[in-house]
């Protein structure tokens, strides 16, 4: 009599990962009497994946009846299918017995899995970094099957090339993850500035997954101080403006010191935008002169997003003949950022 | 689900010439498609491809001489100087719903010949 | 762009036999290989892809493997339906290109 053939006539089946595959088997013969079982993988490790006779297999259903006389199609079905049902299955027969004696095995059907990366999730330095430094930032995805994928970053469109790009494991896997990290200079023109984070999967339809990250929250901008007299008014009062310009975030707060005494302290709120996303803001401080014997030494101290203060300092002359005094006059930068206006 | 490819005619060299791809049982914003060519008695030769979303990627010899584009229900595929070597059967396809590294709906084809 | 180089060019095979079609990618496509059947004034129609996964409906008597640069398509038992003309395309998944073999003419005696 012709020797019995289990038949798996797919070498490989690929599917999508959420729906069901279909495993074929047929035998060319009812004798002898035994089961089909359906294993993954070979050798003592192996993993029953469908029995009739017995155990429960919620996800697994048999393509025919296989209660039904002369059956010889053993086929199944797997429902939502993961990447952890890659693998390869065989179908195996089985002569009935005392125990049951494993007589042929199928040649396996390979299943592989495919499944789309997750949408890249970027993230920035924890603390933010001033112009020219640079700042590191590292892009994610998922769960995606099979391995082969590309990662690339832009910065306002342009591609970035210092980058560091690992894919996980290295070996065999039902499903792998992605991690890049990629390394940014900083300019003063950043504040509007984006990187994305590209992936492009052979499951995509679309275009690449996109992640993006503003560097809006990675940079600080620090401010630039300048302090100006206006003309001295007829009433002795002299008035000092102190112009803090080009920083960001606005998170500010400006101090005034007379003499090294606190005379006022302001926050920055609700400042209107420049076009590069920096901020300006002046602030005016009267001083009465003829309050004064001596001169005056004023402070314009500037704490920028909890960072060490920035003060510029000059004095005012104090004269016998007080509107006398030079009008409209800058305060020069020196090194000890004090300022002599007569 | 099928496509078919519409618009092939005799053309002169440098006149546009605008090829249609029209699908029915599935939807354009779902899939990949493609557009391919076979010149007379030789093999299949790959254009380009629109994304689902509408981006056109294109082979590297095109270099300008085709464009792709689609409405809901079409693909587009101009040709916009057309050369008597574009003379040929133009397809279009459908990639799998696997992956886009293999197409499994194909049109039958439409012709076009470019003459003086 | 990545070139295939598909050999033979033409084969011819008695029913029942079995031929052998190779196709050679100019580096690694990763298994992201299909292979295509065309008849004369006919659409091509796909029989295998991701290099050797089976397109529904399509006969187990036609066979893909390979992997990196190699490739394979294997007809056994022939028919005399299966004259036809076989193309392999390739996908790079870092060019995101296509390709296509220059085509294996196959004649059934």
């Known amino acids: 009599e012709e020797e019995l053939q289990v038949i798996q006539p797919e070498k490989s089946v690929s599917v999508a990962a959420g729906d069901s595959a279909t495993l074929n088997c047929t035998v060319s013969s009812l004798i002898p009497v035994g089961p089909i079982q359906w294993f993954r993988g070979a050798g003592p490790g192996r993993e029953l994946i469908y029995n009739l006779k017995e155990g429960h297999f919620p996800r697994v259903t048999p393509v025919s009846d296989p209660t039904k006389r002369n059956n010889m199609d053993f086929s199944i079905r797997i429902s939502n299918i993961t990447p952890a049902d890659a693998g390869t299955y065989y179908c195996v027969k089985f002569r009935k017995g005392s125990p049951d004696v494993e007589l042929k095995s199928g040649a396996g059907t390979e299943l592989s899995v495919r499944a789309k990366p997750s949408a890249p999730v970027v993230s920035g330095p924890a603390v933010r970094a001033t112009a020219e430094h640079t700042v590191s930032f590292t892009c994610e995805s998922h769960g995606f099957s099979p391995r082969d994928i590309t990662l690339k970053w832009f910065k306002n469109g342009n591609e970035l090339s210092d980058v560091q790009t690992n894919v996980d494991p290295a070996g065999k896997s039902v499903s792998y993850s992605i991690r890049s990290t990629a390394r940014v200079v900083l300019t003063r023109r950043d504040v509007h500035s984006q990187v994305i984070c590209e992936v492009a999967h052979v499951t995509l339809q679309g275009d690449p997954l996109r992640g993006t990250a503003n560097l809006s929250e990675a940079i600080r901008v620090p401010p630039f101080l300048e302090v100006t007299q206006q003309s001295m008014r007829a009433d002795n009062q002299v008035n000092v403006t102190c112009q803090v310009t080009k920083f960001y975030p606005q998170r500010l707060q400006l101090t005034w010191l007379e003499n090294g005494n606190v005379s006022r302290t302001e926050m920055a709120s609700a400042l209107p935008e420049n076009k590069d996303g920096t901020y300006n803001w002046t602030s005016w401080l009267l001083v009465n002169v003829s309050a004064h014997r001596d001169d005056v030494k004023l402070t314009c101290q500037v704490e920028h997003d909890g960072q060490p203060a920035v003060n510029k300092s000059f004095s005012v002359k104090v004269s016998a003949h007080p509107k006398e005094q030079g009008s409209n006059t800058a305060a020069e930068n020196t090194g000890t950022n004090e300022r002599n206006i007569y | 689900q099928s496509v078919e490819e519409s618009g092939g005619r005799l053309g002169t060299p440098g006149t546009p010439l605008t090829l249609t791809c029209t699908v029915s049982g599935f939807s354009l914003s779902s899939y990949v498609m493609g557009w391919f060519r076979q010149a007379p008695g030789k093999g299949l030769e790959y254009i380009g491809i629109?994304?689902?979303?509408?981006s056109p990627y294109y082979a590297s010899w095109v270099n300008g001489r085709f464009t792709i584009s689609k409405t809901s229900t079409t693909m587009d595929l101009k040709m916009n100087s057309p050369t008597t070597e574009d003379t040929a059967t133009y397809f279009c396809?459908?990639?799998?719903?696997?992956?886009?590294?293999?197409?499994?709906?194909w049109g039958p084809g439409t012709l076009v010949t470019v003459s003086l | 762009d990545i070139v295939m180089t598909q050999t033979p060019s033409s084969v011819e095979a008695a029913v029942g036999g079995t031929v052998t079609i190779k196709c050679q990618a100019g580096q690694s496509i990763n298994s992201y290989l299909a292979w295509y059947q065309q008849k004369p004034g006919q659409r091509p129609k796909l029989l295998i892809y991701y290099a050797s996964t089976l397109e529904s409906g399509v006969p187990s008597r036609f066979k893909g493997s390979g992997s990196g640069t190699d490739y394979t398509l294997t007809i056994s038992d022939l028919e005399s339906a299966d004259a036809a003309t076989y193309y392999c395309q390739s996908w790079h998944y870092i060019s995101r290109s296509y390709a296509f073999g220059g085509g294996t003419e196959v004649v059934v005696k």
């Open positions: 396809a459908r990639v799998g719903p696997l992956g886009v590294d293999y197409f499994n709906i």
């Open positions: 629109i994304s689902s979303s509408g």
